[in-house]
């Protein structure tokens, strides 16, 4: 006769591990009994299980409620057992020692392999401004026995970078994803894909990009300067910019307060029926926790009654 | 024939000592464990040591450890049990009896024992 | 310790009646116990192993059962041999331990 086992039995984290030993004898063989041990290099064996054709299933004390055989039928010649939420410590070497009759004494050797996926996380870098130089987006972190891989996958253009710290039983993987930052990352995902024989598939984390910018400042209304005439109605001015944040708009006159009946919705200033006093210099202030913008303009109201019309002036400064 | 033969019992003082013998026949004495189990007068069985085949490693009852001490010498088919510290609770007939090991510590039942001897401790 | 209950501690019958003795262990010991009978002055001597077999030599009237906590040991029909004390007895842990004892007595 001879053993059947396996040379590697591979579980994850929390599962049962069935630990294989079947004696394929000849007619008439019996097995008496089925001792497993654990038998790692340098250390003496360890008894996990003994099986016993009369005296049934003994389990060692420090795997007590932990060692089984599997269900019914079973078959008088199979010595295989069930290791129950299997752990990383278990990992290692075990021996089957199949005591027959009449032919003697039987063992062979398995290697148990214990998968610990991994559980990722993802860290965002420092808070991302346009103008600075190359940047840290995002670090993603898994730990796992064996090592994970830790890739990522995005339409932003980047450099990474990764490193891996080994532990007794596991190794951590740590890859950073750096970039330089530009308006039009903003709302990009981008996502660390974690790979692992322990997991059925891919895990995935995915960060939004956000890079704080703001855009310069223009305003639009004057665009034809004849339309800005006394008793003119609905004139206004809006101011354009974008940001992220999303910026806030303000309003004034450089050369005095805004007149009565001027209206600041937002980013739009809207006029009463015009008249001269509503000429002069008006300022759009636009800002966000990452910067301020100014655009400034000239309103010269027109009196059609006068001949030639006047020059309007647009400023912007920032 | 499987024979155990006890030997070494008597009246002992308080704190004092005795070393019981158990001669083996009729198996391989090598290949067996041997227990060493007491029953006080009236009482019912308690078992006291064992000491394995393999390599001699022993086990002893809460009740007599480090008192008693258990070896073999199976050059001579010889069980033995050293006490010491005796006290007026140990007073029991002694037996022997063997035990196959199976795997491991773990043996079968004790199917031979021997006809026991009286340990009287008492001043 | 595994702690092994026995029950009852005595009993009277008379020959030709069946007798019952449980044994109860405080935790799983597979098939791991053995049935002994004393008699007064007399070394035990092994009944039954392995929870249910016959020990070479004993009548078949001696039967056992029970696997995992609770085992049972019939005498089919009580013979004037009979009348002594059985024990049970676990080994499967470290120490091996027995129950208190059954006598059967002639009632």
């Known amino acids: 006769g001879e053993l059947e086992t396996s040379d590697v039995v591979t579980v994850v984290l929390g599962q049962d591990a069935k630990l294989p030993c079947f004696y394929r004898g000849d007619s008439g063989e019996q097995v008496g009994q089925v001792a497993w041990a654990r038998v790692d290099a340098g250390e003496g064996a360890q008894e996990l299980a003994l099986l016993h054709s009369k005296y049934g299933l003994h389990v060692s004390p420090a795997y007590e409620g932990r060692v089984e055989q599997p269900p019914p039928p079973r078959n008088p010649l199979d010595g295989s057992v069930l290791l129950r939420n299997a752990v990383q410590a278990d990992e290692g070497e075990y021996e089957c020692r199949v005591s027959t009759f009449p032919a003697g004494s039987f063992q062979a050797r398995l290697r148990l392999r214990v998968l610990v996926p991994p559980l990722p996380s993802l860290n965002p870098g420092p808070a991302l401004e346009e103008g600075q130089g190359l940047t840290l987006a995002a670090s993603c972190t898994a730990e796992g026995s064996p090592a994970p891989s830790v890739t990522w996958d995005t339409e932003v253009k980047g450099t990474t970078s990764s490193r891996s710290f080994k532990h007794s039983r596991s190794a951590a993987v740590t890859s950073e994803f750096h970039l330089v930052p530009s308006r039009s990352m903003n709302g990009q995902p981008l996502t660390c894909v974690v790979s692992h024989p322990g997991l059925l598939q891919d895990q995935r984390i995915t960060h939004i990009l956000h890079v704080s910018f703001l855009a310069e400042a223009s305003v639009r209304g004057l665009e034809d300067q004849n339309l800005w005439h006394i008793g003119r109605e609905g004139a206004m001015l809006k101011c354009l910019s974008e940001g992220q944040p999303p910026p806030s708009y303000n309003w004034t006159r450089l050369d005095g307060p805004l007149p009565s009946g001027v209206r600041v919705d937002g980013d739009t200033l809207g006029f009463p029926p015009l008249t001269t006093e509503h000429s002069g210099i008006y300022v759009c202030h636009v800002s966000n926790e990452f910067s301020s913008r100014d655009s400034q303009v000239t309103v010269d109201v027109l009196d059609p009654q006068e001949d030639s019309g006047k020059q309007v002036d647009l400023v912007s400064a920032s | 024939e499987v024979q155990l033969v006890e030997s070494g019992g008597g009246l002992v003082q308080p704190g004092g000592s005795l070393r019981l013998s158990c001669a083996a026949s009729g198996f391989n004495f090598s290949n067996y464990g041997m227990s060493w189990v007491r029953q006080a007068p009236g009482k019912g069985l308690e078992w006291v040591s064992r000491i394995k085949p393999t390599d001699g490693s022993t086990h002893y009852a809460d009740s007599v450890k480090g008192r008693f001490t258990i070896s073999r010498d199976n050059s001579k088919n010889t069980l033995y049990l050293q006490m010491n510290s005796l006290r007026a609770e140990d007073t029991a007939v002694y037996y022997c009896?063997?035990?196959?090991?199976?795997?491991?510590?773990?043996?079968?039942?004790?199917?031979?024992w021997g006809q026991g001897t009286l340990v009287t401790v008492s001043s | 310790d595994i702690q092994m209950t026995q029950s009852p501690s005595s009993l009277s019958a008379s020959v030709g009646d069946r007798v019952t003795i449980t044994c109860r262990a405080s935790q799983g010991i597979s098939s791991y116990l053995a049935w002994y009978q004393q008699k007064p002055g007399k070394a035990p001597k092994l009944l039954i192993y392995a929870a249910s077999s016959l020990q070479s030599g004993v009548p078949s009237r001696f039967s056992g059962s029970g696997s995992g906590t609770d085992f049972t040991l019939t005498i089919s029909s009580l013979q004037p041999e009979d009348f002594a004390t059985y024990y049970c007895?676990?080994?499967?842990?470290?120490?091996?331990?027995f129950g208190q004892g059954t006598k059967v007595e002639i009632k």
């Open positions: 007895q676990q080994h499967y842990t470290t120490p091996p331990t």
């Open positions: 009896a063997r035990a196959e090991l199976l795997a491991f510590d773990v043996y079968t039942a004790s199917d031979y």
